[in-house]
């Protein structure tokens, strides 16, 4: 195999692989016909100038997870055929300005997870064929204007997890072919108007986990092909009217973990491909009529962990396909009887951890397919007669942690609960709060001795009319829905803390998270 170095393996197809901590210097001599060279998990700290002179046919060079801290300016001389270069997961702090001048046919350049503190303006000036540039996980405090100007073929750029606090509005102006731009995990507080205007082919924009406070009204107006927009875990307090109006292809939008106080009518849409919208962990206090009216394909709407005290009767207009609505952990005291009227396909509604004092008898009137209702931890003393009677598919109803008043008015609810005890689950049953004589007793099995007929609840009633729920959840509820934030230690944890592995930490949700 043309002199394969002893510490490497070489295949007859010109593939060379050198791995292991015992390698402390560049192996040599390398076979002259090598087309792919991988140097992985070694203790190589330096790349001299002369090591690749004799392997001009090299197409792919992968030097990852080494101790590489120093690269000589002419290290890649004579590698004119190189298409793919990865120097990821090393200890590079600086790159010689002319390091890449002889590899002008590169298509992918991976520099992620190093310690780069700056990029020279001319660093990438010869890369007209470059398609992918990964700079994730460095220490770049700012991106010089003009540094990407020659990357006219670039389709994927990852600048995530660096330290930069601002962007020049012209930094991306020549990247008309860019499709994926990842800027997450930086310290951006403001994005100048026009920053993304040249990116007409952009399909994914990741801005999550920055410190963005405001969005310019027309920030995304030239990005009509955008399909994924991640804005979660920022400091956004306001969504300008029309901010999302030019995004007809959007199918993923995350806004959780911001400081949103209100939503203007129609701010979302039209977005016919959006199926799930996460707005939890904001400061939203009220929802106006038609807040989501353009989202006619939305299936999941998560508004938990806000400060909602008022929901307009028409707030959910247009959400004809909504299946899951999460309103838990807010400040709701009252709900209008028509608030859910347009939600004909709703299956799960979570209203736990609010301050609801009563529910209108008609609140679920048009929502015949409801399967789970979470009402625990509110201020409910009773419920209207027949409120659940038409809900034939209801298989999970949580009513515990409410101050139930077990006087004669509770009898209809008591009777219904006895007949439908299986729907209450087995974890926690509703308990009487007053009068004092029955405080702490289960509302389901209490002997109700009021003026009027006495009702003794059977321990395990036979419920002949109970629907077949063999395929329904028994006790897991809407409370384990899609909430995707860092963990907290309170009772309503939103996420298991999951360390990122290979840049791919999962959306973690816990049963307790109540989403």
């Amino acid at each position: 195999y043309y002199g394969c170095p002893s510490e490497c393996t070489c295949s007859r197809a010109s593939q060379v692989e050198c791995t292991g901590a015992q390698i402390v210097a560049m192996p040599s001599p390398l076979p002259w016909n090598a087309m792919s060279l991988q140097i992985l998990n070694t203790h190589i700290t330096e790349l001299p100038e002369d090591k690749f002179l004799n392997i001009s046919a090299l197409i792919a060079l992968k030097m990852e997870k080494n101790e590489l801290a120093n690269i000589m300016p002419g290290a890649f001389r004579n590698l004119g055929s190189l298409r793919h270069l990865s120097l990821a997961n090393n200890k590079l702090k600086n790159l010689p300005v002319r390091l890449f001048q002889d590899v002008n046919n590169l298509e992918t350049l991976l520099l992620s997870n190093n310690q780069l503190v700056q990029i020279q303006p001319a660093q990438f000036s010869q890369f007209s064929n470059l398609k992918e540039l990964q700079l994730y996980g460095n220490n770049l405090e700012y991106i010089p204007e003009g540094v990407f100007d020659h990357l006219v073929g670039l389709t994927k750029l990852n600048l995530g997890n660096n330290g930069f606090t601002h962007l020049s509005p012209r930094v991306f102006q020549h990247l008309g072919n860019l499709q994926v731009l990842r800027l997450y995990e930086n310290r951006l507080s403001d994005i100048p108007m026009g920053t993304f205007d040249a990116l007409g082919n952009l399909q994914e924009l990741a801005l999550q986990e920055n410190q963005i406070g405001t969005l310019s009204p027309g920030l995304f107006h030239n990005n009509r092909n955008l399909q994924r927009l991640y804005l979660s875990n920022n400091h956004i307090s306001h969504l300008p009217p029309g901010i999302f109006m030019q995004l007809p292809h959007l199918n993923k939008l995350t806004l959780f973990g911001n400081s949103l106080k209100e939503l203007s009518p129609g701010v979302f849409g039209p977005m016919p491909n959006l199926r799930e919208l996460w707005l939890y962990n904001n400061h939203i206090t009220s929802l106006p009529d038609n807040a989501f009216s353009h989202l006619n394909q939305l299936q999941v709407l998560i508004l938990s962990h806000n400060q909602l005290s008022y929901i307009s009767p028409g707030a959910f207009n247009g959400l004809t396909n909504l299946r899951e609505l999460s309103l838990h952990t807010n400040a709701l005291q009252d709900l209008d009887g028509n608030v859910f009227r347009s939600l004909a396909n709703l299956r799960n509604v979570s209203l736990q951890n609010n301050r609801l004092r009563q529910l209108p008898g008609s609140i679920f009137a048009n929502v015949n397919g409801l399967m789970t209702i979470q009402l625990q931890n509110n201020n409910l003393e009773n419920l209207p007669l027949g409120i659940f009677d038409h809900l034939g598919n209801l298989c999970e109803l949580r009513l515990y942690d409410n101050p139930w008043r077990c006087d004669s008015n509770i009898l209809p609810l008591h009777d219904w609960l006895i007949l439908n005890r299986a729907r209450l689950g087995t974890d926690t049953l509703p308990v009487c709060s007053s009068p004092a004589s029955v405080r702490g007793q289960s509302l389901v099995i209490i002997n109700v001795n009021f003026p009027g007929p006495s009702v003794q609840g059977p321990e395990t009633p036979e419920v002949s009319s109970y629907p077949d729920t063999s395929s329904y959840p028994d006790s897991t509820s809407i409370s384990s829905t899609t909430e995707i934030t860092r963990s907290t230690d309170d009772d309503y944890t939103d996420l298991n803390t999951i360390e990122p592995i290979d840049d791919r930490n999962t959306w973690g949700m816990t049963d307790a998270q109540s989403g």
Epitope: E132, N201, Q227, T254, T482, R504, W507
Partner: antibody, heavy 122, light 107 residues
Framework: QVQLVESGGGLVKPGGSLRLSCAAS????????MSWIRQAPRKGLEWVSS????????YYADSVKGRFSISRDNAKNSLYLQMNSLRAEDTAVYYC???????????????WGQGTMVTVSS | DIVMTQSPSSLSASVGDRVTITCRAS??????LAWYQQKPGKAPKILIY???SLESGVPSRFSGSGSGTDFTLTISSLLPEDFVTYYC?????????FGPGTKVEIK
């Protein structure tokens, strides 16, 4: 270890029904979206249906819409596929898979079951 | 729906060869593409996600590239266990369509 095990497959007549189950273990089931994928004999893979971790969002291929129903029971770490009005062209190995995704570019069916065979024939 | 096509549908190669499989989407899917390997009688196994990222535990001879509509899977040096079928799949939007597959056979 992380594992998915399908069951419920078998021989059924056209127009009949079948209910597939998938038992998950080794990971927090309620953290993940789940999916069904099928593979007809000597054919390629076909995505059938996906369900969000809470069960709120549900997606179907056009070829099964209105006939198949996906559901999950997070308390039992189980995924289900109720198949009604079965046709000969539904004959396939049915796999359940964990759909893992995040906002950093990870999108994949990263864990698969071994599959269960469904044969629709008179 | 997004239609995924793969080429070639089958290819013959030898142990040690470098092979490239192409996957094309009918419309732009950014980099929301995964590659799977399936051995006969077994479930598929994830190789590549995000078009070019190697799944943990997958040998480094596998690599992916591309974004938008054109994607490639490259096996830098075929081993005997690599002579199986490979599928691409898009995750950009529902339905999450697969390519028809490419069978890699021994020459």
């Amino acid at each position: 270890q992380v594992q998915l095990v399908e069951s419920g497959g078998g021989l059924v007549k056209p127009g009949g029904s079948l209910r597939l189950s998938c038992a998950a273990s080794g990971f927090t089931f309620s953290d993940y979206y789940m999916s069904w994928i099928r593979q007809a004999p000597r054919k390629g893979l076909e995505w059938v249906s996906s369900i969000s971790n809470s069960g709120g969002a549900i997606y179907y291929a056009d070829s099964v819409k209105g006939r198949f129903s996906i559901s999950r029971d997070n308390a039992k770490n189980s995924l289900y596929l109720q198949m009604n009005s079965l046709r000969a062209e539904d004959t396939a190995v049915y796999y359940c898979a964990r759909y893992n995704w995040n906002d950093r570019g990870y999108d994949a069916f990263d864990i698969w079951g071994q599959g269960t065979m469904v044969t629709v024939s008179s | 729906d997004i239609v995924m096509t793969q080429s070639p549908s089958s290819l013959s190669a030898s142990v040690g060869d470098r092979v490239t499989i192409t996957c094309r989407a009918s419309q732009g899917i950014s980099s929301a593409l995964a590659w799977y390997q399936q051995k006969p009688g077994k479930a598929p196994k994830i190789l590549i996600y995000d078009a070019s990222s190697l799944e943990s535990g997958v040998p480094s001879r596998f690599s992916g590239s591309g974004s938008g509509t054109d994607f490639t899977l490259t096996i830098s040096s075929l081993l005997p266990e690599d002579f199986v079928t490979y599928y691409c799949q898009q995750f950009n939007s529902y339905p999450h369509t697969f390519g028809p597959g490419t069978k890699v056979e021994i020459k």
